[in-house]
């Protein structure tokens, strides 16, 4: 008895997690992700913002931007030349939508200490980068691309037709920022700064959405944004190159779209130099099944950019559409013309593929019943990469290196075993030629990033071990988290679980769903997070699950294209099915069930409510989709293909959320809905409520004025404590 | 301070060769295109050749291709006009220029005379 | 090749006046790809303005351009005793880069 008394009186001296505690961000945690500037040096901005350069082989740091010449421009970011004679520092930033903002940009000249002063840039500036090579610099200012030589010469204007939400120059439209590249960029250097390639956006056909934002005048005022919405007019894309040693000479040149493509609507995926002369462009059909990797060639005599068709190589779903998310990227070997890429093999698992002549000759790299995710760099003898295959766990994350100076090619695990209970989720970070790279583990345990040697793996120091973080944890009940897996009609579901630090079994508890559900998402992944629902589980007793359904990523094609053409349905189906199967457990009050979920999940836990299963006791739906017709083209398409009669019109009209509207009697529904959101728009919770009304169904609502699709800031602290409430109330918990 | 001395002109008989020197200072060279331009006794401006920063691509007008070669030597910081073939039509005050982007030139040197003349 | 035809040949104004001198272009230049320049007897000629309004770095604000398409203008607001020169437009639009014939701006 007296290990117990020991333990209890241990626990008494602990607390549970508050509301306050992840309003706050108490137990937020760091990474740290070198900024590399060669094979075996980085910068880094240090605890007191001075920018520090560190060389590992010598193991010498010095700084070489100090924080007072940061702050005396007010940075927030920086950027150092190649030639390390100059930094930009950003300054006055201001967000636009997901990854774009404009900001005011300062050139710092580093051998003289000074400010760089005549043609200083305008402002605000859209997009600016360094050359690859050097100190030119190309930027995007009122959606137009000038460069400059060097940071005080004159700008050289590169496009002139540039219009606010008309024609986007070097930056994409709303669209393909979200939903394509996904960047707020759209020009690319040669690598060494010899072309400059840019895309051309054409919105000028394109229906706009427009909303208001209220501020604080007397009058709102109108937010206007081109954005296509499912089966609408789409943006006329054209990518250009110019030669930026002499780029007056012929201009900027269009780089041909191949025949197969421009027979009807396209997209232009992603563009990747492969030499200063040698560039190969990613495109996609509007019906986004089929993609063709055109590799073009610089032709000095006609100063054009020709696209053979026998460099074409396609890739084409029978099954569903073409790629994840997105069409993965080439990754380019040393020959220049051959490269690795990610795509289905003959069983529907994405795997690494390395195609030299013909995407039928493909030689595929790795194989199994798991997936490779991402390739992060292929040097002259190895390629590294991450996948899932580490004990059949999709959730994970592990970085590998295949051996491909060798035959037979052989594979190592550089991280399976590294800090196994702790590090499970890895992503990486390379230097030039792989001399050395960071990993970052982001949990199951604290997250941890090490520096290690790239020739042996060696763990050389470790970057950021987030001590405070831990020690903080110390005195804190944290919930129970397991990873687990059900197996229903040949359907694997895995399930996370989060339990209350006091867990029995044979007690019951309040039941909350977690959901996202989207199509090639994942919830379900062993990572570390001290959120909301760690509060709930750890203070109000609450268990959360989260499941990842048909539709969901890393598990192969049967799982992920399950959904297509048919969104709404077995995701939905999967949640209810999981719910089910945790009340058999025993410890689930099935009185006492809820589901929440945000964006895509507000759509599926909206519809889980309105199922009709008398299973959900409530549930919250934030900035949900309501109605596939309403959003982005780009996005819907993808799953669902077009509106209309000869498509599928018939499932966009049967997958509302307003069709049900009858269903959400028996249930107690919040609705919460920013009314600047861009991204999923205030009209589609404006239609539930509005359904709702009519039906004469009673619910409650929430809307966040002038916030946007993240329901930041103060609206983040109002909307978690509304939702506790909300919660506790439906669970009849105390306050 | 930009400077550009322009060197290596003089009287010169038709059909003969002459090369002119150009030594830059105040810049970084080998980042800029540099270029030719001739003026004619009292007559107007006409752009002779250009190089790129590197040396790498060379532009000629017409009414010099296949006589006048441009280069440059990036570690002494000059550039070279090499004429061949010349003609008295080439009488002219030969500047070289700092060549922003292909299209403008900014600073010029002060140029130097050469004159073709039996 | 684009040629340039610039007007009048000579103007003839006082110190004080306004100038105003023309440049047409045989062809469309691309994207406003003009410069002037103004040249002193003996002297190198001077980069004035590029992009057909943008002033060059250390030019006097009293020297603006304007125009598009085939047809650019030189204005000096207030003359100086200094500007009293030969003036040239010149295109990078197109390949061979052209040069107009020149203004003389003298003194009345």
């Known amino acids: 008895l007296r290990p117990s008394r020991v333990h209890n009186s241990e626990e008494n001296t602990m607390r549970a997690l508050t509301l306050k505690d992840i309003l706050n961000g108490t137990f937020s945690y760091k990474t740290f992700f070198p900024n590399w500037i060669s094979g075996q040096e980085y910068l880094h901005q240090s605890a007191d913002n001075n920018i520090v350069l560190y060389n590992i082989e010598t193991g010498q740091s010095y700084t070489i931007l100090s924080n007072r010449t940061m702050k005396s421009v007010n940075a927030s970011n920086y950027g150092l030349s190649p030639d390390r004679q100059f930094v930009y520092l950003e300054s006055d930033y201001s967000k636009l939508w997901r990854y774009s903002y404009t900001a005011t940009y300062y050139i710092y000249d580093l051998s003289n200490g000074e400010f760089v002063r005549g043609n200083e840039l305008p402002r605000p500036i859209q997009y600016l980068c360094w050359s690859p090579v050097g100190s030119k610099l190309a930027y995007v200012y009122q959606n137009n691309i000038y460069l400059k030589q060097r940071p005080g010469d004159p700008p050289f204007q590169i496009t002139f037709n540039g219009r606010e939400n008309k024609i986007f120059n070097g930056i994409p439209d709303w669209v393909y920022e979200e939903e394509m590249l996904p960047t707020k960029y759209a020009l690319w250097w040669s690598p060494n700064g010899k072309f400059l390639a840019y895309a051309e956006f054409n919105d000028k056909d394109i229906p706009v959405i427009a909303y208001s934002y209220y501020g604080d005048e007397q009058y709102p005022r109108t937010i206007n944004i081109p954005y296509p919405k499912a089966g609408a007019k789409n943006p006329v894309v054209r990518i250009f190159i110019i030669d930026t040693t002499y780029p007056a000479y012929v201009g900027p040149q269009e780089v041909p779209v191949p025949a197969m493509i421009a027979s009807s609507d396209y997209y232009f995926s992603w563009l990747t130099w492969v030499t200063d002369e040698r560039v190969c462009l990613q495109w996609l059909k509007r019906v986004q099944n089929v993609s063709v990797l055109s590799i073009c060639d610089f032709r000095e005599d006609w100063q054009t950019w020709d696209c053979p068709k026998t460099q074409e190589h396609i890739e084409e779903s029978r099954t569903g559409w073409a790629g994840g998310f997105f069409v993965s990227r080439p990754v380019f070997s040393y020959d220049a013309i051959s490269y690795y890429k990610i795509f289905s093999d003959k069983d529907g698992y994405k795997h690494i593929h390395y195609i030299k002549d013909t995407v039928e000759n493909a030689i595929q790299i790795t194989s199994g019943k798991w997936e490779a995710i991402n390739i992060f760099r292929v040097t002259q003898d190895s390629l590294f990469y991450s996948s899932n295959e580490f004990e059949e766990y999709p959730g994970r994350r592990n970085i590998y290196r295949i051996s491909i100076g060798s035959y037979p090619p052989s594979k190592k695990c550089v991280t399976c075993h590294l800090r196994k209970e702790r590090c499970q989720y890895y992503t990486a970070s390379f230097s030039d030629y792989a001399k050395y790279y960071a990993l970052v583990c982001y949990g199951p345990g604290i997250p941890i990033s090490t520096l290690h040697d790239g020739r042996t793996d060696q763990e050389i120091k470790i970057l950021e071990e987030n001590k405070e973080l831990e020690n903080a944890l110390k005195n804190i009940q944290l919930p129970k988290e397991e990873i687990k897996k059900l197996e229903v009609d040949e359907i694997t579901l895995w399930y996370k679980m989060i339990l209350p630090p006091q867990f029995d079994r044979s007690k019951k508890y309040p039941l909350l769903i977690q959901v996202y559900g989207g199509p090639c998402s994942q919830s379900v992944r062993s990572v570390f997070a001290v959120n909301w629902i760690s509060y709930l589980a750890s203070k109000e007793g609450m268990v959360i699950a989260l499941v990842d359904g048909r539709g969901t990523a890393f598990q192969g094609d049967k799982l992920l294209y399950a959904v297509y053409r048919k969104l709404g349905v077995y995701e939905v189906e999967d949640q209810i099915t999981a719910v089910r199967k945790f009340i058999e457990m025993g410890f689930i009050d099935e009185k006492r069930i809820a589901i929440w979920g945000w964006s895509y999940g507000g759509y599926v836990s909206s519809l889980a409510l309105a199922s009709g299963t008398g299973l959900f006791k409530c549930g919250i739906a934030v900035a949900p989709v309501s109605s596939w017709e309403y959003y982005a083209s780009v996005y819907t398409e993808r799953f669902m293909g077009l509106p209309t009669k000869d498509d599928n019109l018939e499932h966009y009209k049967n997958s509302t959320v307003m069709a049900r509207a009858e269903y959400f009697r028996n249930v107690d529904y919040l609705l919460i809905h920013g009314t600047a959101d861009d991204n999923v728009h205030f009209q589609n919770s404006a239609q539930i409520a509005k359904a709702l009304v009519n039906a004469q169904v009673d619910f409650q609502a929430m809307w966040y004025s002038d916030q946007n699709h993240g329901l930041s800031g103060l609206s983040t602290n109002h909307l978690y404590t509304h939702m506790t409430h909300f919660l506790k109330q439906c669970f009849s918990l105390s306050d | 301070e930009v400077q550009l001395l322009e060197s290596g002109g003089g009287l010169v008989q038709p059909g003969g060769s002459l090369r002119l020197s150009c030594a830059a200072s105040g810049f970084t060279f080998s980042s800029y295109a540099m270029s030719w331009v001739r003026q004619a006794p009292g007559k107007g401006l006409e752009w002779v050749s250009a190089?790129?920063?590197?040396?790498?691509?060379?532009y000629y007008a017409d009414s010099v291709k296949g006589r006048f070669t441009i280069s440059r030597d990036n570690s002494k910081n000059t550039l070279y006009l090499q004429m061949n073939s010349l003609r008295a039509e080439d009488t002219a005050v030969y500047y070289c220029?700092?060549?922003?982007?292909?299209?403008?030139?900014?600073?010029w040197g002060q140029g130097t005379l050469v004159t073709v003349s039996s | 090749e684009i040629v340039l035809t610039q007007s009048p040949g000579t103007l003839s104004l006082s110190p004080g006046e306004r100038a105003t001198l023309s440049c047409r272009a045989s062809q469309s230049v691309s994207s406003s790809y003009l410069a002037w320049y103004q040249q002193k007897p003996g002297q190198a000629p001077r980069l004035l303005i590029y992009?057909?309004?943008s002033r060059a770095t250390g030019i006097p604000d009293r020297f603006s351009g304007s125009g598009s398409g085939t047809d650019f203008t030189l204005t000096i607001s207030r003359l100086e005793p200094e500007d009293f020169a030969v003036y040239y437009c010149?295109?990078?639009?197109?390949?061979?880069?052209?040069f107009g014939h020149g203004t003389k701006l003298e003194i009345k």
């Open positions: 190089i790129s920063g590197s040396g790498g691509s060379t």
């Open positions: 220029a700092k060549d922003y982007y292909g299209g403008w030139f900014d600073p």
């Open positions: 010149q295109q990078y639009g197109s390949s061979p880069r052209t």
């Open positions: 992009g057909a309004s």
